[in-house]
Interface confidence: low
Amino acid sequence: HTAAQDNCTCPTNKMTVCSPDGPGGRCQCRALGSGVAVDCSTLTSKCLLLKARMSAPKNARTLVRPNEHALVDNDGLYDPDCDPEGRFKARQCNQTSVCWCVNSVGVRRTDKGDLSLRCDELVRTHHILIDLRHRPTAGAFNHSDLDAELRRLFRERYRLHPKFVAAVHYEQPTIQIELRQNTSQKAAGDVDIGDAAYYFERDVKGESLFQGRGGLDLRVRGEPLQVERTLIYYLDEIPPKFSMKRLT
Protein backbone atom coordinates (compact mmCIF):
# COMPACT_ATOMS: atom_id res chain seq x y z
CA HIS A 1 0.00 0.00 0.00
CA THR A 2 1.54 3.31 -1.01
CA ALA A 3 -1.15 5.56 0.41
CA ALA A 4 -4.13 5.53 2.72
CA GLN A 5 -6.53 3.27 0.84
CA ASP A 6 -9.82 4.36 2.37
CA ASN A 7 -9.78 8.03 1.31
CA CYS A 8 -6.75 7.91 -1.01
CA THR A 9 -4.42 10.44 0.56
CA CYS A 10 -0.69 10.48 1.19
CA PRO A 11 0.01 10.34 4.96
CA THR A 12 3.57 11.59 4.60
CA ASN A 13 3.05 14.39 2.08
CA LYS A 14 0.03 16.64 1.86
CA MET A 15 1.46 18.41 -1.19
CA THR A 16 0.27 15.63 -3.49
CA VAL A 17 -2.62 14.75 -5.75
CA CYS A 18 -3.86 11.21 -5.21
CA SER A 19 -6.20 8.98 -7.19
CA PRO A 20 -7.02 5.25 -7.24
CA ASP A 21 -5.27 4.67 -10.57
CA GLY A 22 -2.35 2.59 -9.37
CA PRO A 23 -1.96 -1.16 -10.00
CA GLY A 24 -5.12 -3.01 -9.02
CA GLY A 25 -6.94 0.24 -8.40
CA ARG A 26 -4.62 1.14 -5.56
CA CYS A 27 -4.20 4.71 -4.44
CA GLN A 28 -1.33 6.45 -6.17
CA CYS A 29 -0.07 9.90 -5.23
CA ARG A 30 1.92 12.38 -7.30
CA ALA A 31 3.84 15.38 -6.02
CA LEU A 32 2.48 18.78 -6.94
CA GLY A 33 4.63 20.71 -9.36
CA SER A 34 6.54 17.71 -10.72
CA GLY A 35 3.89 15.02 -11.10
CA VAL A 36 6.38 12.44 -9.83
CA ALA A 37 4.83 9.40 -8.11
CA VAL A 38 5.83 9.34 -4.44
CA ASP A 39 6.12 6.56 -1.88
CA CYS A 40 3.68 7.52 0.85
CA SER A 41 5.14 5.06 3.33
CA THR A 42 8.21 7.27 3.77
CA LEU A 43 9.32 10.88 3.51
CA THR A 44 9.22 12.62 0.16
CA SER A 45 12.54 14.05 -0.99
CA LYS A 46 13.26 17.68 -0.20
CA CYS A 47 13.71 18.48 -3.89
CA LEU A 48 10.20 17.33 -4.78
CA LEU A 49 8.81 19.14 -1.72
CA LEU A 50 10.48 22.41 -2.69
CA LYS A 51 9.17 22.02 -6.23
CA ALA A 52 5.67 21.39 -4.88
CA ARG A 53 6.00 24.38 -2.58
CA MET A 54 6.88 26.62 -5.51
CA SER A 55 3.73 25.52 -7.29
CA ALA A 56 1.72 26.69 -4.27
CA PRO A 57 1.53 30.18 -2.67
CA LYS A 58 4.98 31.28 -1.46
CA ASN A 59 6.12 31.65 2.14
CA ALA A 60 9.28 33.46 3.20
CA ARG A 61 12.16 31.30 4.80
CA THR A 62 16.14 30.54 7.68
CA LEU A 63 25.18 29.06 17.48
CA VAL A 64 27.88 27.82 16.67
CA ARG A 65 28.88 26.60 13.24
CA PRO A 66 30.56 23.18 13.23
CA ASN A 67 33.44 24.57 11.12
CA GLU A 68 34.25 27.14 8.47
CA HIS A 69 32.79 24.96 5.71
CA ALA A 70 29.30 24.81 7.23
CA LEU A 71 26.54 26.12 4.98
CA VAL A 72 23.32 27.85 5.96
CA ASP A 73 20.45 28.07 3.50
CA ASN A 74 20.39 31.85 3.12
CA ASP A 75 19.14 31.85 -0.46
CA GLY A 76 15.60 30.99 0.49
CA LEU A 77 13.15 29.25 -1.80
CA TYR A 78 13.75 28.42 -5.42
CA ASP A 79 12.15 26.12 -7.98
CA PRO A 80 14.65 23.28 -8.17
CA ASP A 81 15.46 20.76 -10.89
CA CYS A 82 15.10 17.22 -9.56
CA ASP A 83 16.36 14.01 -11.12
CA PRO A 84 14.01 11.05 -11.80
CA GLU A 85 14.66 9.75 -8.25
CA GLY A 86 13.67 13.08 -6.75
CA ARG A 87 17.20 14.14 -5.83
CA PHE A 88 18.51 17.61 -6.51
CA LYS A 89 20.39 17.96 -9.77
CA ALA A 90 23.92 19.12 -9.03
CA ARG A 91 23.46 22.26 -11.13
CA GLN A 92 20.51 24.58 -10.56
CA CYS A 93 19.64 27.56 -12.75
CA ASN A 94 16.99 30.24 -12.53
CA GLN A 95 14.92 31.71 -15.32
CA THR A 96 17.55 34.36 -16.02
CA SER A 97 20.21 31.71 -16.74
CA VAL A 98 22.04 32.29 -13.48
CA CYS A 99 23.38 28.90 -12.33
CA TRP A 100 25.04 27.46 -9.22
CA CYS A 101 25.99 24.10 -7.75
CA VAL A 102 24.10 22.60 -4.82
CA ASN A 103 24.68 19.80 -2.34
CA SER A 104 22.35 16.87 -1.68
CA VAL A 105 20.07 19.05 0.45
CA GLY A 106 19.75 21.66 -2.28
CA VAL A 107 21.84 24.36 -0.60
CA ARG A 108 24.14 26.42 -2.82
CA ARG A 109 27.80 25.48 -2.44
CA THR A 110 29.46 27.62 -5.12
CA ASP A 111 29.34 31.17 -6.37
CA LYS A 112 26.63 31.89 -8.90
CA GLY A 113 27.67 31.74 -12.56
CA ASP A 114 26.17 31.45 -16.00
CA LEU A 115 25.07 28.50 -18.13
CA SER A 116 28.72 27.52 -18.66
CA LEU A 117 29.08 26.62 -14.96
CA ARG A 118 29.89 22.95 -14.48
CA CYS A 119 28.82 20.91 -11.45
CA ASP A 120 30.48 17.54 -11.88
CA GLU A 121 28.70 15.65 -9.13
CA LEU A 122 26.05 16.03 -6.48
CA VAL A 123 28.09 16.41 -3.31
CA ARG A 124 26.58 14.68 -0.31
CA THR A 125 25.73 16.55 2.87
CA HIS A 126 26.92 14.07 5.48
CA HIS A 127 26.57 16.12 8.67
CA ILE A 128 23.65 18.36 9.63
CA LEU A 129 23.57 20.42 12.81
CA ILE A 130 20.09 21.55 13.81
CA ASP A 131 20.37 24.40 16.27
CA LEU A 132 17.20 25.19 18.25
CA ARG A 133 16.33 27.64 20.97
CA HIS A 134 13.32 26.70 23.08
CA ARG A 135 10.94 29.06 24.76
CA PRO A 136 11.50 29.71 28.47
CA THR A 137 10.28 26.98 30.82
CA ALA A 138 10.03 26.69 34.58
CA GLY A 139 13.38 24.89 34.60
CA ALA A 140 15.81 23.25 32.25
CA PHE A 141 14.79 19.99 30.61
CA ASN A 142 16.54 16.88 31.84
CA HIS A 143 19.23 16.26 29.19
CA SER A 144 18.73 12.50 29.18
CA ASP A 145 14.95 12.82 28.74
CA LEU A 146 15.38 15.44 26.03
CA ASP A 147 17.90 13.28 24.21
CA ALA A 148 15.61 10.23 24.32
CA GLU A 149 12.55 12.17 23.17
CA LEU A 150 14.29 13.82 20.22
CA ARG A 151 15.84 10.53 19.11
CA ARG A 152 12.44 8.91 19.34
CA LEU A 153 10.86 11.76 17.40
CA PHE A 154 13.29 11.36 14.52
CA ARG A 155 12.65 7.65 14.43
CA GLU A 156 8.87 7.70 14.83
CA ARG A 157 7.80 10.76 12.94
CA TYR A 158 10.52 10.96 10.32
CA ARG A 159 11.45 7.27 10.16
CA LEU A 160 15.15 8.06 10.45
CA HIS A 161 17.21 5.15 11.69
CA PRO A 162 18.53 5.88 15.22
CA LYS A 163 22.14 5.33 14.16
CA PHE A 164 21.98 8.54 12.09
CA VAL A 165 21.20 10.72 15.13
CA ALA A 166 24.79 11.20 16.25
CA ALA A 167 24.21 13.39 19.30
CA VAL A 168 21.85 15.71 21.12
CA HIS A 169 23.53 18.60 22.96
CA TYR A 170 21.76 20.86 25.45
CA GLU A 171 22.73 24.09 27.14
CA GLN A 172 19.51 25.81 28.13
CA PRO A 173 17.88 27.21 26.08
CA THR A 174 19.93 25.92 23.13
CA ILE A 175 19.46 22.41 21.77
CA GLN A 176 21.68 21.02 19.04
CA ILE A 177 20.77 17.86 17.14
CA GLU A 178 23.56 16.31 15.10
CA LEU A 179 22.62 14.11 12.16
CA ARG A 180 25.39 12.16 10.38
CA GLN A 181 25.02 9.92 7.35
CA ASN A 182 27.88 9.09 5.00
CA THR A 183 27.23 7.79 1.49
CA SER A 184 28.51 4.37 2.54
CA GLN A 185 26.18 4.24 5.57
CA LYS A 186 22.96 4.97 3.71
CA ALA A 187 21.30 1.74 2.64
CA ALA A 188 18.38 1.36 0.24
CA GLY A 189 15.21 2.42 2.00
CA ASP A 190 16.96 4.56 4.60
CA VAL A 191 15.53 8.04 5.05
CA ASP A 192 18.02 10.73 4.07
CA ILE A 193 19.13 13.02 6.89
CA GLY A 194 18.47 16.03 4.64
CA ASP A 195 14.85 15.01 4.14
CA ALA A 196 14.36 14.31 7.86
CA ALA A 197 15.88 17.69 8.76
CA TYR A 198 13.60 19.46 6.26
CA TYR A 199 10.46 17.79 7.62
CA PHE A 200 11.58 18.68 11.15
CA GLU A 201 12.26 22.28 10.15
CA ARG A 202 8.81 22.61 8.64
CA ASP A 203 7.25 20.96 11.70
CA VAL A 204 8.83 23.33 14.21
CA LYS A 205 7.70 26.26 12.06
CA GLY A 206 4.12 25.02 12.26
CA GLU A 207 4.08 24.08 8.58
CA SER A 208 3.76 20.31 8.86
CA LEU A 209 4.07 18.37 5.62
CA PHE A 210 2.15 15.40 6.97
CA GLN A 211 -1.40 14.85 5.80
CA GLY A 212 -4.19 15.49 8.26
CA ARG A 213 -2.03 15.50 11.38
CA GLY A 214 -1.93 18.28 13.87
CA GLY A 215 1.27 20.19 14.27
CA LEU A 216 4.21 18.80 16.15
CA ASP A 217 3.31 18.44 19.82
CA LEU A 218 6.71 17.71 21.30
CA ARG A 219 6.81 17.00 25.03
CA VAL A 220 9.56 15.99 27.39
CA ARG A 221 8.12 14.18 30.41
CA GLY A 222 4.83 15.92 29.68
CA GLU A 223 6.39 19.39 29.51
CA PRO A 224 5.85 21.09 26.11
CA LEU A 225 9.01 21.83 24.16
CA GLN A 226 8.27 24.91 22.10
CA VAL A 227 10.88 26.02 19.61
CA GLU A 228 11.26 29.75 18.99
CA ARG A 229 14.27 29.73 16.67
CA THR A 230 15.84 27.25 14.29
CA LEU A 231 19.19 27.40 12.47
CA ILE A 232 20.41 24.51 10.35
CA TYR A 233 24.04 24.07 9.33
CA TYR A 234 25.03 21.70 6.55
CA LEU A 235 28.45 20.08 6.14
CA ASP A 236 29.34 18.42 2.87
CA GLU A 237 31.68 15.50 2.21
CA ILE A 238 33.66 17.87 -0.02
CA PRO A 239 34.07 21.47 1.24
CA PRO A 240 32.16 24.13 -0.72
CA LYS A 241 33.87 26.31 -3.33
CA PHE A 242 33.20 30.00 -2.78
CA SER A 243 35.43 32.85 -3.91
CA MET A 244 37.16 34.94 -1.26
CA LYS A 245 34.91 37.93 -1.88
CA ARG A 246 31.97 35.99 -0.43
CA LEU A 247 33.93 35.35 2.75
CA THR A 248 34.79 38.97 3.47
Epitope: P11, S41, S144, A148, R151, R152, L153, R155, E156, R157, R159, P162, G189, F210, R213, G214, L216
Partner: antibody
Framework: AVTLDESGGGLQTPGGALSLVCKGS????????MGWVRQAPGKGLEYVAA???????GYGAAVKGRATISKDTGQSTVRLQLNNLRAEDTATYYC?????????????????WGHGTEVIVSS | ALALTQPSSVSANPGETVEITCSGG????????YGWYQQKAPGSAPVTVI????KRPSNIPSRFSGSTSGSTNTLTITGVQADDEAIYFC???????FGAGTTLTVL
Protein backbone atom coordinates in the same frame (compact mmCIF):
# COMPACT_ATOMS: atom_id res chain seq x y z
CA ALA B 1 24.47 -15.57 14.56
CA VAL B 2 22.41 -13.94 17.31
CA THR B 3 21.68 -16.28 20.21
CA LEU B 4 19.71 -15.62 23.38
CA ASP B 5 19.90 -18.16 26.20
CA GLU B 6 17.48 -17.98 29.13
CA SER B 7 17.95 -19.57 32.53
CA GLY B 8 16.32 -19.51 35.96
CA GLY B 9 12.94 -21.07 35.27
CA GLY B 10 11.37 -23.98 37.10
CA LEU B 11 8.86 -24.59 39.88
CA GLN B 12 8.20 -21.54 42.06
CA THR B 13 5.99 -21.02 45.08
CA PRO B 14 3.19 -18.41 45.23
CA GLY B 15 4.34 -15.25 46.99
CA GLY B 16 7.96 -16.06 46.24
CA ALA B 17 10.43 -14.38 43.92
CA LEU B 18 11.82 -15.35 40.57
CA SER B 19 15.04 -14.34 38.83
CA LEU B 20 15.49 -15.04 35.13
CA VAL B 21 18.70 -14.32 33.24
CA CYS B 22 19.23 -14.03 29.51
CA LYS B 23 22.70 -14.10 27.96
CA GLY B 24 23.09 -12.64 24.50
CA SER B 25 25.81 -13.33 21.97
CA UNK B 26 26.52 -12.67 18.32
CA UNK B 27 25.68 -8.94 18.47
CA UNK B 28 26.81 -5.76 20.19
CA UNK B 29 24.79 -6.18 23.37
CA UNK B 30 25.14 -2.57 24.54
CA UNK B 31 23.54 -1.18 21.37
CA UNK B 32 20.10 -2.79 21.59
CA UNK B 33 17.03 -2.79 23.78
CA MET B 34 16.31 -6.16 25.39
CA GLY B 35 13.26 -7.54 27.08
CA TRP B 36 11.02 -10.36 28.18
CA VAL B 37 7.80 -11.70 26.66
CA ARG B 38 5.82 -14.53 28.20
CA GLN B 39 3.21 -17.02 27.05
CA ALA B 40 0.86 -18.77 29.46
CA PRO B 41 -0.22 -22.30 28.50
CA GLY B 42 -2.73 -22.12 25.64
CA LYS B 43 -2.59 -18.32 25.54
CA GLY B 44 -1.04 -15.61 23.39
CA LEU B 45 2.10 -13.55 23.84
CA GLU B 46 2.31 -10.97 26.62
CA TYR B 47 4.88 -8.21 27.05
CA VAL B 48 6.57 -8.36 30.46
CA ALA B 49 9.41 -5.83 30.55
CA ALA B 50 12.13 -4.21 28.47
CA UNK B 51 15.26 -2.15 28.96
CA UNK B 52 16.73 0.20 26.37
CA UNK B 53 20.38 0.58 25.41
CA UNK B 54 20.42 3.64 27.66
CA UNK B 55 18.83 1.63 30.52
CA UNK B 56 15.37 3.21 30.48
CA UNK B 57 12.82 0.57 31.44
CA GLY B 58 9.23 -0.36 30.70
CA TYR B 59 6.86 -2.89 32.24
CA GLY B 60 3.67 -4.65 31.28
CA ALA B 61 0.53 -3.89 33.26
CA ALA B 62 0.35 -7.40 34.77
CA VAL B 63 3.78 -7.15 36.41
CA LYS B 64 4.13 -3.42 37.10
CA GLY B 65 5.25 -2.88 40.67
CA ARG B 66 6.40 -6.50 41.01
CA ALA B 67 9.03 -6.68 38.28
CA THR B 68 12.50 -5.21 37.88
CA ILE B 69 14.52 -5.51 34.70
CA SER B 70 18.25 -4.79 34.71
CA LYS B 71 21.26 -5.55 32.58
CA ASP B 72 24.97 -6.15 32.82
CA THR B 73 26.50 -4.93 29.58
CA GLY B 74 29.91 -6.36 30.44
CA GLN B 75 28.42 -9.83 30.81
CA SER B 76 25.90 -9.32 27.98
CA THR B 77 23.08 -10.35 30.27
CA VAL B 78 19.62 -9.03 31.05
CA ARG B 79 17.86 -10.05 34.26
CA LEU B 80 14.18 -10.13 35.18
CA GLN B 81 13.28 -10.14 38.87
CA LEU B 82 9.62 -10.89 39.57
CA ASN B 83 8.32 -10.72 43.14
CA ASN B 84 5.10 -11.78 44.85
CA LEU B 85 4.56 -14.57 42.37
CA ARG B 86 1.02 -15.61 41.45
CA ALA B 87 -0.40 -18.66 39.71
CA GLU B 88 -1.10 -16.47 36.67
CA ASP B 89 2.64 -15.87 36.28
CA THR B 90 2.92 -19.48 35.11
CA ALA B 91 4.22 -19.24 31.55
CA THR B 92 7.13 -19.77 29.22
CA TYR B 93 9.32 -16.66 29.44
CA TYR B 94 11.14 -15.62 26.29
CA CYS B 95 14.09 -13.28 26.12
CA UNK B 96 13.73 -11.00 23.10
CA UNK B 97 16.11 -8.59 21.38
CA UNK B 98 15.03 -5.35 19.73
CA UNK B 99 16.33 -4.29 16.36
CA UNK B 100 16.86 -0.84 17.89
CA UNK B 101 18.45 0.61 20.98
CA UNK B 102 16.64 3.74 21.95
CA UNK B 103 13.36 2.81 23.55
CA UNK B 104 11.92 0.32 26.01
CA UNK B 105 8.61 0.44 24.12
CA UNK B 106 9.68 -2.26 21.79
CA UNK B 107 7.07 -4.89 20.98
CA UNK B 108 7.02 -4.01 17.27
CA UNK B 109 10.81 -4.09 17.06
CA UNK B 110 11.75 -7.59 18.24
CA UNK B 111 14.10 -9.18 15.73
CA UNK B 112 15.34 -12.21 17.70
CA TRP B 113 13.97 -14.54 20.39
CA GLY B 114 15.41 -17.03 22.85
CA HIS B 115 14.09 -20.58 23.16
CA GLY B 116 12.28 -19.75 26.39
CA THR B 117 12.36 -20.96 29.97
CA GLU B 118 9.32 -22.47 31.64
CA VAL B 119 8.09 -21.09 34.94
CA ILE B 120 5.43 -22.86 37.01
CA VAL B 121 4.01 -21.11 40.06
CA SER B 122 2.30 -23.65 42.25
CA SER B 123 2.15 -24.72 45.86
CA ALA C 1 -4.23 -1.38 27.17
CA LEU C 2 -5.14 -1.11 23.52
CA ALA C 3 -6.39 -4.33 21.96
CA LEU C 4 -4.93 -5.32 18.61
CA THR C 5 -7.35 -6.78 16.11
CA GLN C 6 -6.31 -9.58 13.79
CA PRO C 7 -8.37 -12.38 12.20
CA SER C 8 -8.46 -15.62 14.16
CA SER C 9 -7.73 -17.75 11.11
CA VAL C 10 -6.89 -17.60 7.42
CA SER C 11 -6.29 -20.36 4.91
CA ALA C 12 -4.66 -20.62 1.51
CA ASN C 13 -3.52 -23.14 -1.03
CA PRO C 14 0.20 -23.57 -1.67
CA GLY C 15 1.48 -20.91 -4.06
CA GLU C 16 -1.30 -18.45 -3.26
CA THR C 17 -0.81 -15.06 -1.65
CA VAL C 18 -2.20 -14.56 1.82
CA GLU C 19 -2.67 -11.32 3.72
CA ILE C 20 -3.10 -11.01 7.50
CA THR C 21 -4.07 -7.63 8.91
CA CYS C 22 -3.46 -6.08 12.29
CA SER C 23 -4.98 -2.85 13.56
CA GLY C 24 -5.62 -0.97 16.76
CA GLY C 25 -2.05 -0.15 17.77
CA UNK C 26 -1.30 3.13 19.47
CA UNK C 27 0.15 5.88 17.35
CA UNK C 28 3.28 7.79 18.17
CA UNK C 29 3.61 11.23 16.60
CA UNK C 30 0.89 10.11 14.22
CA UNK C 31 2.67 6.97 13.02
CA UNK C 32 2.00 3.31 13.72
CA UNK C 33 4.51 0.51 14.18
CA TYR C 34 3.93 -3.24 14.10
CA GLY C 35 5.88 -6.47 14.12
CA TRP C 36 4.90 -10.01 13.07
CA TYR C 37 5.96 -13.12 14.94
CA GLN C 38 5.52 -16.71 13.75
CA GLN C 39 4.98 -19.58 16.18
CA LYS C 40 4.90 -23.08 14.72
CA ALA C 41 3.46 -24.70 17.88
CA PRO C 42 2.34 -23.36 21.27
CA GLY C 43 5.32 -23.29 23.60
CA SER C 44 7.86 -23.28 20.78
CA ALA C 45 9.97 -20.15 20.40
CA PRO C 46 8.47 -17.43 18.20
CA VAL C 47 10.36 -16.34 15.10
CA THR C 48 10.29 -12.75 13.86
CA VAL C 49 9.18 -12.55 10.23
CA ILE C 50 8.68 -8.76 10.10
CA UNK C 51 9.62 -6.04 12.58
CA UNK C 52 9.22 -2.27 12.52
CA UNK C 53 6.45 -2.50 9.88
CA UNK C 54 8.54 -3.60 6.94
CA LYS C 55 11.93 -4.91 8.05
CA ARG C 56 12.69 -8.58 7.49
CA PRO C 57 15.41 -10.40 9.42
CA SER C 58 18.11 -11.81 7.16
CA ASN C 59 17.06 -15.42 7.75
CA ILE C 60 13.46 -14.83 6.64
CA PRO C 61 12.49 -15.54 2.99
CA SER C 62 11.57 -12.61 0.78
CA ARG C 63 8.05 -13.98 0.33
CA PHE C 64 7.25 -12.38 3.71
CA SER C 65 6.61 -8.64 3.59
CA GLY C 66 4.92 -6.01 5.72
CA SER C 67 3.13 -2.82 4.73
CA THR C 68 1.22 -0.12 6.55
CA SER C 69 -1.81 1.88 5.49
CA GLY C 70 -3.00 4.33 8.10
CA SER C 71 -3.27 2.46 11.38
CA THR C 72 -3.46 -1.01 9.79
CA ASN C 73 -0.46 -3.20 9.07
CA THR C 74 -0.62 -6.12 6.66
CA LEU C 75 1.61 -9.18 6.63
CA THR C 76 1.73 -10.57 3.10
CA ILE C 77 3.03 -14.04 2.28
CA THR C 78 3.52 -14.34 -1.46
CA GLY C 79 3.55 -17.92 -2.71
CA VAL C 80 2.63 -19.51 0.58
CA GLN C 81 4.28 -22.84 1.41
CA ALA C 82 3.26 -25.72 3.66
CA ASP C 83 6.08 -24.75 6.04
CA ASP C 84 4.39 -21.37 6.61
CA GLU C 85 1.54 -23.02 8.51
CA ALA C 86 1.71 -21.45 11.97
CA ILE C 87 0.17 -18.92 14.33
CA TYR C 88 1.10 -15.34 13.49
CA PHE C 89 1.04 -12.73 16.24
CA CYS C 90 1.27 -9.02 15.58
CA UNK C 91 2.79 -6.67 18.12
CA UNK C 92 2.40 -2.90 18.43
CA UNK C 93 4.89 -0.24 19.40
CA UNK C 94 4.06 2.13 22.25
CA UNK C 95 1.07 0.14 23.48
CA UNK C 96 3.43 -2.86 23.85
CA UNK C 97 0.63 -5.31 23.18
CA PHE C 98 0.25 -8.39 21.00
CA GLY C 99 -2.73 -9.54 19.01
CA ALA C 100 -4.44 -12.81 19.90
CA GLY C 101 -2.86 -14.53 16.92
CA THR C 102 -3.97 -15.66 13.47
CA THR C 103 -3.78 -19.35 12.58
CA LEU C 104 -2.63 -19.84 9.00
CA THR C 105 -3.70 -23.13 7.49
CA VAL C 106 -2.12 -24.22 4.23
CA LEU C 107 -4.64 -26.45 2.49
Amino acid sequence: AVTLDESGGGLQTPGGALSLVCKGSGFTFSSYAMGWVRQAPGKGLEYVAAISSGSSTGYGAAVKGRATISKDTGQSTVRLQLNNLRAEDTATYYCAKSGYGGSASYVSDIDAWGHGTEVIVSS
Amino acid sequence: ALALTQPSSVSANPGETVEITCSGGGDYYGTYYYGWYQQKAPGSAPVTVIYDNTKRPSNIPSRFSGSTSGSTNTLTITGVQADDEAIYFCGSYKSNTFGAGTTLTVL
